[in-house]
């Protein structure tokens, strides 16, 4: 056997090159036939009407033909015939790769609630061979379940991903990425998750700045509530007691002027949205006012200030205990 061919793999729409090569040429006739055994070329003559076949080279040692705009129907065995004694026949198989026609991602719900499990489907339509679908949530790969449907030598792959969503997933892309021999680089489609979650409540003490609350001082607390949708209700209550008469509520802020020991207690900021309710507690402890010392005869402002500060710390045994002022989130 001195007639040789090579199998060809080509992407749909591109060009396939079929070559019939003769090792030891004796000027025998070379003929190329299609899978229906119709003659494409007899030597350098093409009787077949399909003008997508063009002669690239014809000699006693090679018949080389190009097939442009390859379609799936061109797939199959192409026969090279060499009329030696005895006649020789060799075949080349053309395999046509078809990239997925369409890539569609479908999320069961446009908006999900934290803790909920949602279904995400991705469909890669009409490819050959079947497409491999990979899932990513942000940069994290997830495992889906694929189903393959075959129709007329083409494959439609649908991959299902069951995803339990958390608040951190809000705004994160869910990516459907396909891997296919006819696709170079990344072919992917994505949808951004929209996750609703109950508020997260955090209390910030905006006054006094150094964090110590003393009798006669003022207190200002700000309640920060973040949720999706943004909380509609932010309220302040005093746990197990009435709110002091001199307390002032203004939106997310709580003001208490002229603190006294009776103001000690737990102050709660509550926030809610359509998903749920949450709160955070602030335990107020009002310290004694600082001990004052009569000013010395020679006044050095800087020294006095320094001395006062030192004396205060020494005098008030609880002055440094930050643990007595705490906010508890729930």
């Amino acid at each position: 056997q001195n007639l040789f061919t090579k199998d060809v793999t080509v992407i749909e729409g591109e060009v396939a090159t079929i070559s019939c090569q003769v090792n030891k040429s004796d000027d025998s006739v070379i003929q190329l036939l299609n899978p229906n055994r119709q003659t494409i070329y007899f030597r350098d003559f093409r009787p077949l009407k399909d003008s997508r076949f063009q002669l690239l080279n014809f000699s006693s040692s090679e018949l080389k033909v190009s097939l442009t705009n390859v379609s799936i129907s061109d797939e199959g065995r192409y026969f090279c015939q060499l009329y030696t004694d005895p006649p020789q026949e060799s075949y080349t198989t053309i395999t046509v790769l078809v990239p997925p026609r369409n890539l569609m991602i479908d999320i069961q719900k446009d908006t999900a609630v934290e803790g909920e499990e949602i279904e995400v489907n991705c469909t890669a339509m009409a490819s050959k061979p079947a497409t491999t679908i990979r899932w990513f949530k942000g940069n994290t790969e997830l495992k889906g379940k694929s189903e393959v449907e075959e129709w007329s030598d083409m494959y439609t792959v649908t991959s299902q991903l069951m995803l339990k969503v958390h608040k951190e997933d809000d705004g994160v892309p869910v990516i459907c990425q396909v891997e296919h021999p006819a696709v170079t680089g990344n072919l992917q489609t994505q949808r951004y998750l929209e996750v609703q979650y109950k508020p997260q409540v955090h209390i910030q003490m905006t006054y006094p700045l150094q964090g110590l609350t003393r009798e006669g001082d003022a207190l200002e607390l700000t309640c920060e509530a973040i949720g999706k949708p943004q909380p509609v209700m932010v309220t302040w209550v005093r746990v197990d007691d009435e709110m002091p008469q001199h307390a002032v509520l203004s939106g997310p802020n709580l003001f208490i002027n002229n603190l006294n020991k009776t103001d000690n207690g737990t102050y709660r900021c509550e926030a809610s949205n359509i998903v749920g309710k949450a709160h955070s507690d602030y335990m107020l402890y009002v310290y004694d006012p600082p001990t004052t010392i009569p000013p010395p005869t020679t006044t050095t402002t800087t020294t006095t200030t320094t001395t006062t500060t030192i004396l205060t710390i020494i005098t008030d045994s609880r002055a440094g205990e930050e643990g007595s002022i705490r906010a508890v989130d729930h």
Partner: antibody
């Protein structure tokens, strides 16, 4: 210059065998890129292909369905010619008989001048 | 009955263009060949393959093909083009078939 020349009797009796020869000059009957054909023409049937012989490392014959059971085409390499035998002829076989060279098995690029054969008693 | 169909007769004024057609299922796959035959003479190949002319055939002869129809066009017909024209291809079994012929008259 390639030439083809038909020869044979111009009159054949019904039920007998029609025999014709085509002499080739300027080409070889054993050419591996040609086929050698017999075609006939009559007013009632127009041009009608009868069959071919060709060499592609071995000899091949193709015959028209209409005459398959009673036709033989043979090459004669020693005389560089090919022949037609048509058995059991009837007046319907009366026609001008042409030998023709075919490129591959695709088109007739050269014809003989033709010979009229009449089938009559 | 022939598997290639041609109009029996076509006429053309001298110097004008004429198209002779040939129809058949096999022409969807294969090109037709065209032959010119003058009275008392053997047929002569004028067009083969996609649109190939053997040497000695004037360039006013051209061939084309679409679907199941092959056409022979003579652009600027001359008096000597008056003849019978036959198309040729193969049937579904691979047998050689000829059209019934078209008689071209040049007026």
């Amino acid at each position: 210059q390639v030439q083809l020349q038909e020869s044979g009797p111009g009159l054949v009796k019904p039920s007998q065998t029609l025999s014709l020869t085509c002499a080739i000059s300027g080409d070889s009957v054993s050419s591996n890129s040609a086929a050698w054909n017999w075609i006939r023409q009559s007013p009632s049937r127009g041009l009608e292909w009868l069959g071919r012989t060709y060499y592609r490392s071995k000899w091949y014959n193709d015959y028209a369905v209409s005459v398959k059971s009673r036709i033989t085409i043979n090459p004669d390499t020693s005389k560089n010619q090919f022949s037609l035998q048509l058995n059991s002829v009837t007046p319907e076989d009366t026609a001008v008989y042409y030998c023709a060279r075919e490129y591959g098995i695709w088109y007739f690029d050269l014809w003989g001048r033709g010979t009229l054969v009449t089938v009559s008693s | 009955s022939s598997e290639l169909t041609q109009d029996p007769a076509v006429s053309v004024a001298l110097g004008q263009t004429v198209r002779i057609t040939c129809q058949g299922d096999s022409l969807r796959s294969y090109y037709a060949s065209w032959y010119q035959q003058k009275p008392g003479q053997a047929p002569v190949l004028v067009i083969y393959g996609k649109n190939n002319r053997p040497s000695g055939i004037p360039d006013r002869f051209s061939g084309s093909s679409s679907g199941n129809t092959a056409s022979l066009t003579i652009t600027g017909a001359q008096a000597e083009d008056e003849a019978d024209y036959y198309c040729n291809s193969r049937d579904s079994s691979g047998n050689v078939v000829f059209g019934g012929g078209t008689k071209l008259t040049v007026l």
